[in-house]
């Protein structure tokens, strides 16, 4: 922003009314009137170039300083070329001196040179030569000087002529202010420019109405330079929640719009599934049945719990069930869907039911599932199971209702026994097996069927209540096909795979463990 000038003294504008003091009185400087563009102009001039040793003073009236700390003095003047005078006037000069004196009171006509301090010697950039003078084409010079810091109530300026031909057309004394400013939604008051060139006056700004310093942000500050220019902005204000920046002000969000926090962003339209907001809203309330999770930004549409997993199937495989489902048709507008699987078992005889989480095994933890399938094992035979798959999202906890689908399955068989060969000899095979512990109580006996490989006409059966058996009276170096099946009160369970086990040849005799 451009500096603002406050004029303390303007000779040209005063129309010769100022009545400055000349010393010595009646000699040297003289007030003259001229006509330029049909307007009278006044000037103080002096032209004692032929006489030697000139010391002519022109002192301004006392100027009240007011709030100025540094003043700027702008001079407009002409100087005639010494060579334009006969003989070059050996005592002729082409410069004059500028002085100032501070005081707390007006000394009136009491003029004392010793009180004045020299500011500078003023030399012209261009001098007016004879031909210019005769053609009334004078060369006007403009020079500016500054003085500061000033501390007294007022001051005088003085011009010392030492033998030049000078006409002083304008003397303008002013000080500079940094103008009132609105920047970054902060108001900076009009500030007097400092007096020391290297230093900048720090000025605190105040946030405009409905603007605030953001949390953790810096208070708005600007620096007012000597020349009245604002420099180095620091910090800023932002329109508070519910308001947006319109030019240099903060305006309330229109109805149907909101702004959640102090920021540079404009007000946003209320998102989907919200109610129309009033003017100046910081958020938009959710429609009935829609919610915001604590971590949801205000700009996100309100959402609702998902519908149930849409399709669900339970495929029984022995004492295992694979549950597969598809995502909800209605995600509720969210992507953070997880699934939970729960299990209930019912005894067909009594119709009694209860949870079965403790007795079954899931292929992965059954809560917070992101995949859409899970395998449940260690199911008991001859039991009815109902599986519930629930879909949840980030707002499900805000409602009491649940979104679930159920599937029922009856386990009719035990899981096939896992069979291994424990030892063998030329005439025997020692076989053991296992089934999941939850199913063991349902098993009455185990049936071991074996026959020679390639002989489909005859087979042998052994029944036992234990988990192992030794098959004797076998032929040496012969492969036998062995299968184990659990027998329950309700009938046969699932049979194991058919295993091929070979007895030892006579050369490799001895009971060798495998």
């Amino acid at each position: 922003a451009q500096g603002k000038e406050v004029v303390l003294l303007d000779f040209a504008a005063a129309g010769g009314e100022l009545g400055w003091l000349t010393h010595p009185y009646g000699k040297g400087w003289d007030l003259m009137q001229n006509i330029m563009n049909d307007m009278p102009i006044y000037m103080y001039s002096v032209c004692n170039v032929m006489s030697g040793d000139q010391d002519n003073w022109l002192r301004t009236n006392w100027v009240y300083r007011g709030e100025a700390e540094r003043i700027f003095i702008e001079l407009k003047f002409t100087v005639r070329d010494c060579n334009s005078f006969p003989g070059g006037a050996s005592s002729c000069k082409e410069t004059f001196n500028l002085y100032y004196a501070e005081s707390d009171l007006d000394y009136g006509t009491n003029f004392q040179k010793r009180l004045f301090t020299k500011i500078d010697t003023i030399a012209p950039d261009e001098i007016t030569v004879s031909s210019d003078f005769e053609a009334r084409h004078v060369k006007l010079n403009v020079e500016e000087r500054s003085v500061g810091p000033l501390t007294r109530k007022g001051f005088y300026l003085a011009f010392q002529d030492i033998g030049a031909c000078v006409a002083l057309l304008s003397v303008r004394v002013y000080y500079k202010k940094c103008p009132e400013l609105l920047q970054g939604l902060a108001h900076f008051p009009e500030t007097i420019a400092g007096s020391d060139a290297p230093s900048l006056a720090t000025v605190a700004g105040t946030c405009v109405d409905h603007a605030v310093v953001p949390p953790g942000g810096e208070e708005p500050r600007m620096h007012c330079a000597v020349d009245g220019e604002w420099l180095v902005p620091i910090g800023q204000c932002l329109c508070q929640a519910g308001y947006e920046k319109v030019e240099d002000a903060c305006q309330a969000c229109s109805p149907g719009f909101f702004k959640f926090e102090a920021s540079e962003s404009p007000c946003l339209e209320c998102p989907e599934h919200t109610l129309p907001s009033p003017e100046g809203a910081t958020s938009c309330e959710c429609e009935e049945g829609f919610f915001r999770a604590p971590q949801d930004p205000a700009s996100m549409p309100c959402t609702r719990p998902p519908s149930a997993p849409h399709y669900l199937t339970a495929v029984g495989m022995g004492a295992k069930v694979e549950l597969r489902w598809t995502p909800p048709q209605d995600s509720g507008g969210r992507e953070d869907i997880v699934y939970s699987v729960t299990c209930e078992q019912c005894w067909p005889e009594s119709g009694e039911c209860g949870p079965c989480e403790a007795s079954v095994r899931y292929s992965e933890p059954p809560h917070g599932l992101t995949r859409t399938s899970v395998t449940v094992s260690d199911l008991e035979p001859h039991m009815n199971y109902t599986f519930t798959v629930e879909a949840r999202n980030g707002v499900s906890g805000l409602v009491t209702s649940r979104s679930f689908r159920t599937a029922s399955v009856s386990i009719n068989q035990t899981e096939p026994p896992k069979v291994r060969l424990e030892g063998r000899s030329t005439t025997s095979l020692s076989v053991s097996w296992s089934i999941p512990p939850p199913q063991q109580s349902r098993v009455w006996k185990y049936e071991v069927t074996y026959r020679k490989k390639g002989d489909s006409n005859s087979y042998n059966v052994r029944r036992t209540e234990g988990f192992s058996v030794t098959l004797d009276d076998l032929a040496p170096d012969t492969t036998y096909l062995v299968q184990v099946q659990a027998l329950t009160q309700e009938g046969q369970g699932a049979g194991s795979k058919v295993h091929e086990f070979q007895t030892l040849s006579p050369e490799g005799s001895g009971n060798l463990a495998v």
């Epitope: 399709y311 598809t326 048709q329 159920t406």
Partner: antibody, heavy 120, light 107 residues
Framework: EVQLVESGGGLVKPGGSLKLSCEAS????????MYWVRQTPEKRLEWVAT????????HYLDSVKGRFTISRDNAQNNLYLQMSSLKSDDTAMYYC?????????????WGQGTLVTVSA | DIVMTQSHKFMSTSVGDRVRITCKAS??????VAWYQQKPGQSPKLLIY???TRHTGVPDRFTGSGSGTDYSLTISSVQAEDLALYYC?????????FGGGTKLEIK
């Protein structure tokens, strides 16, 4: 026995409107999501719209969004498809469909269809 | 959207033959694939769902299989009444999408 009977099809000019109906019987209508599926003259099958059992959720094929509205009247066991700003691409046989019992299977039951022809 | 691709628009077979119609999904659909049969002048009818489960009343000559992105419908011994259009459909996520169809023709 599950029965779905569509009606309301016919010849309509581009930009025109039509409302299809599907009357359901033989099951508890308010227990099921319902669908409209169409079959283009080239025999391509295309799901068009879904409505939840209570009517609170609807979902549409992108190309019909804003032009078609699926709705239901659970008291009257009726499903509707309001079609507006019709285009020649909407020419198809329109079927209403229902999932299987307890949502174990998709589109287990279909109506006989109603033909919509969009032509100048 | 999930794209279902049936690479054969037509398949020609003889009564008693074994025929396999294939379908490929553009992403894993976790076996949520259904097969529909549409005879001329009729509505589509569900044959298979969840990739391999036969719908009520469907003859056991129809078998579905597959996982991930690759699925197939096999008719073990084609009958004259199997002349129809066969569509696969993913019922995993909306929009539920269908394959372009395979027309089974009897030689």
């Amino acid at each position: 026995e599950v029965q779905l009977v569509e009606s309301g099809g016919g010849l309509v000019k581009p930009g025109g409107s039509l409302k299809l109906s599907c009357e359901a019987s033989g099951f508890t209508f308010s227990d099921y999501y319902m669908y409209w599926v169409r079959q283009t003259p080239e025999k391509r099958l295309e799901w068009v719209a879904t409505i939840s059992d209570d009517g609170s959720f609807t979902h549409y094929l992108d190309s019909v969004k804003g032009r078609f509205t699926i709705s239901r009247d659970n008291a009257q066991n009726n499903l509707y498809l309001q079609m507006s700003s019709l285009k020649s691409d909407d020419t198809a046989m329109y079927y209403c469909a229902r999932d299987g019992y307890r949502y174990d299977r998709p589109f287990a039951y279909w109506g006989q269809g109603t033909l919509v022809t969009v032509s100048a | 959207d999930i794209v279902m691709t049936q690479s054969h628009k037509f398949m020609s077979t003889s009564v008693g033959d074994r025929v396999r119609i294939t379908c490929k999904a553009s992403q894993d659909v976790n076996t949520a694939v259904a097969w529909y049969q549409q005879k001329p002048g009729q509505s589509p009818k569900l044959l298979i769902y969840w990739a391999s489960t036969r719908h009520t009343g469907v003859p056991d000559r129809f078998t579905g299989s597959g996982s991930g992105t690759d699925y197939s419908l096999t008719i073990s011994s084609v009958q004259a009444e199997d002349l129809a259009l066969y569509y696969c459909q993913q019922h995993y996520s909306t929009p539920y999408t269908f394959g372009g169809g395979t027309k089974l023709e009897i030689k």
